[in-house]
Interface confidence: low
């Protein structure tokens, strides 16, 4: 039962994270939550950083600054793969949830 619950939590978290990405950066509250998650867990996007390419409100050559290894204003614009966290947040935060929830 515990595993089923954990999988459900992961699935819900994945869906919720992707929904929040769709609202980025239009919704300031959503943006701050995602930015905090990405910066704290050193991750970018749901599955990986390329998820941001699919977000209509984000220009194609951009990820949130919170994806950067060294976060500075505008660092996500014209980013280079070496300068950002490439690992997805769902797996990374999910691992933390599995250990702590």
């Amino acid at each position: 039962a515990g595993y089923v619950f954990r999988d459900k939590v992961m699935s819900e978290f994945n869906n919720n994270f992707r929904q929040q990405m769709e609202n980025y950066p239009k919704n300031n509250h959503t943006a701050s939550i995602l930015d905090r998650m990405q910066a704290d867990f050193k991750c970018c996007g749901a599955a990986n950083y390329t998820d941001w390419e699919k977000i209509p409100s984000m220009s194609k050559n951009r990820v949130p600054d919170s994806c950067c290894i060294n976060v500075t204003v505008g660092c996500g614009i014209n980013f280079n793969e070496k300068a950002i966290h490439k690992e997805g947040c769902v797996e990374k935060i999910g691992g933390w949830l599995r250990k702590n929830v």
């Epitope: 390329t50 194609k60 014209n78 980013f79 280079n80 793969e81």
Partner: antibody, heavy 117, light 108 residues
């Protein structure tokens, strides 16, 4: 695979406006940064500017004379340079800036523009 | 603007030899935003290296890039006949984006 093709007059008179078009095939102009770069014997390779979803960035040395715009319906972007002189004689390239690498990963073959009366 | 100075202007080498090309910036460039291009006569430049050391798609592993700050290097480990060309470095971290003046690698 994205391909780029420049087109426009090869000869422009001094003080007139240079107009070039770059046609994008194999990809949407709605993605990426679309650049103009020129190469002359005197100045080497010189970045002119880019357009990205109608937002632009120009080289300050050319900004007062340059307009880069895009036509999404035709999947094209264009360069207009006013008040040209002989110093603007060069090979003009259009180039795509890639997602994740951000260098100029795809180039057109270039078009020679001569400014002369 | 950031001025990129390439050296030497011309490099005369034989096929099979190692080529080392230098690019020096007038101010610090993030290594994430330094590229190298190859250009042959009558052709457009071709991207070789981006992010100072990442090879572009389809570029053979004899091409490698390194460096940080103001000093960057392009190395061709063993020159093939098709490698004789002009090589340019370029920075795209600070607008306006700028190119070096080029290094010509010619057959000795």
């Amino acid at each position: 695979q994205v391909q780029l093709q420049e087109s426009g007059p090869g000869l422009v008179k001094p003080s007139e406006t240079l107009s070039l078009t770059c046609t994008v095939s194999g990809g949407s102009i709605s993605s990426y940064y679309w650049n103009w770069i020129r190469q002359s014997p005197g100045k080497g390779l010189e970045w002119i500017g880019y357009t990205k979803k109608r937002s632009t960035n120009y080289n300050p040395s050319l900004r007062s004379r340059v307009t880069i715009s895009e036509d999404t319906s035709k999947n094209q972007f264009s360069l207009k340079m006013s008040s040209v002189t002989a110093a603007d004689t060069a090979v003009y390239y259009c180039a795509k800036m890639g997602w994740g690498s951000h260098a100029f990963d795809i180039w057109g073959q270039g078009t020679m523009v001569t400014v002369s009366s | 603007e950031i001025v990129l100075t390439q050296s030497p202007g011309t490099l005369s080498l034989s096929p099979g030899e190692r080529a080392t090309l230098s690019c020096r910036a007038s101010q610090s460039v993030s290594s994430s935003y330094l590229a190298w291009y190859q250009q042959k006569p009558g052709q457009a430049p071709r991207l070789l290296i981006y992010g100072a050391s990442s090879r572009a798609t389809g570029i053979p592993d004899r091409f490698s890039g390194s460096g940080s700050g103001t000093d960057f290097t392009l190395t061709i480990s063993r020159l093939e006949p098709e490698d004789f060309a002009v090589y340019y470095c370029q920075q795209y971290g600070s607008s306006p984006w700028t190119f070096g003046q080029g290094t010509k690698v010619e057959i000795k």
